[in-house]
């Protein structure tokens, strides 16, 4: 004969545990029903009556099957440097993440507690490592033969143009200037235009996130900004 299915509340067999989505109530000494996500225990079970569940009130939630007397409060509204990536509902907490051009300087269990603006690399410096959601850009000086003339959280150093005759030699913050004969550029033909990354940062100046122009393939002087360090080396 099949074993009889016990309905909550019921006394468990000695040494056995309550079933999935049930909990053992110490007072009643019975296995009782848990409340579903989005609800909480309004009345705890007794030996003769099961748990009475009620929906969470506005701005409160429960994410798991539970028997808590009150739902949890949703986190405070996202700050101006954040975007709400998950709204507060009866079943889930609000999640705030940093907006583009910022990174999470202090994280919490889900989302971010404190966002900080991505550092910008000054001219003569490029993005050695792009920022990620949780880490800042690392700026380093341009290596010999490369330059960056921008203040940016995304631009890398790029090679000086190669001149037949140099009018002004390039340095870390300025491209070489050629005499009237057209220069050759150390860029492969059909070079891809790099899209603006979602979030990256750079050196020594107060950041104000700004779009960064992709590298120009028409090599007229003066040169535009360095190509951005597109994407982010994520954690």
């Amino acid at each position: 004969l099949p074993a009889q299915v016990a309905f909550t509340p019921y006394a468990p067999e000695p040494g056995s545990t309550c079933r999935l989505r049930e909990y053992y109530d110490q007072t009643a000494q019975m296995c009782c029903s848990k409340c579903s996500p989005g609800q909480h225990a309004k009345v705890f079970c007794t030996k003769t009556s099961d748990t009475v569940c009620d929906s969470c009130e506005d701005s409160t939630y429960t994410q798991l099957w539970n028997w808590v007397p009150e739902c949890l409060s949703c986190g405070s509204r996202c700050s101006s440097d954040q975007v709400e990536t998950q709204a507060c509902t009866r079943e889930q907490n609000r999640i705030c993440t940093c907006r583009p051009g910022w990174y999470c300087a202090l994280s919490k269990q889900e989302g971010c507690r404190l966002c900080a603006p991505l550092r910008k690399c000054r001219p003569g410096f490029g993005v050695a490592r792009p920022g990620t959601e949780t880490s800042d850009v690392v700026c380093k000086p341009c290596a010999p033969g490369t330059f960056s003339n921008t203040t940016s959280s995304t631009d890398i150093c790029r090679p000086h143009q190669i001149c037949n005759v140099v009018a002004i030699p390039g340095n870390a913050s300025m491209d070489a200037v050629c005499t009237s004969t057209s220069p050759t550029r150390s860029m492969a033909p059909g070079a891809v235009h790099l899209p603006q990354p979602v979030s990256t940062r750079s050196q020594h100046t107060q950041p104000t996130p700004e779009p960064s122009t992709a590298p120009s393939t028409s090599f007229l002087l003066p040169m535009g900004p360095s190509p951005p360090a597109e994407g982010s080396t994520g954690d």
Epitope: R129, K140, S232
Partner: antibody, heavy 118, light 107 residues
Amino acid sequence: EVQLQQSGPELRRPGSSVKLSCKASGYSITDYLLHWVKHSPEHGLEWIGWIDPEDGKTKYGQKFQSKATLTADTSSNAAYMQLSSLTSEDSATYFCAANSGTGTMDAWGQGASVTVSS
Amino acid sequence: DIVMTQSPTSMSISVGDRVTLNCKASQNVGSNVDWYQQKTGQSPKVLLYKASIRYTGVPDRFTGSGSGTEFTFTITNMQAEDLAVYFCMQSKSYPITFGSGTKLEIK
């Protein structure tokens, strides 16, 4: 350009540790991030991590988090990698590489061979 | 981890040939791919960064293209001194990962 000079080959017993050095000349190591890369016939090139000698900040690949420790000494213009609890799996050639504002590994050391054998 | 699948593994070529190598990323890496050359007994040397930017001092016979998941590295007019192993590397996300390399040999 920066040149990176690595320490010589090392032979170690299983369970011991080894410290490799990478000395920069021509430029200050603070001008670069310094990466370490493992090269073995079985796994090819594997990124271990980087250190920013300017502030000592490090970033490790998860696989090497408990294996490698990266340090730098600005006074000697050198970076170091210590490998602990060595096993035969750690037998490989290890490269250091300098990363400037180009975002790439501009210059590499000549490599240091580590052999772990009993 | 992002897997960089490089093809072919090896290639026999003649001086003057046009050589094309491919690198395929297991997920979108934008343009965050570098190409390196490693000659026998030497350390690697960067040739191209950000998929297509030729590093300073690198001859213009080396070119690169691609973005997203498909990348191409080309040597036009192969020279004897170009015999080496070439590998790609992605730095879009940690851990940084490398292709297994392509060995160029003389036919």
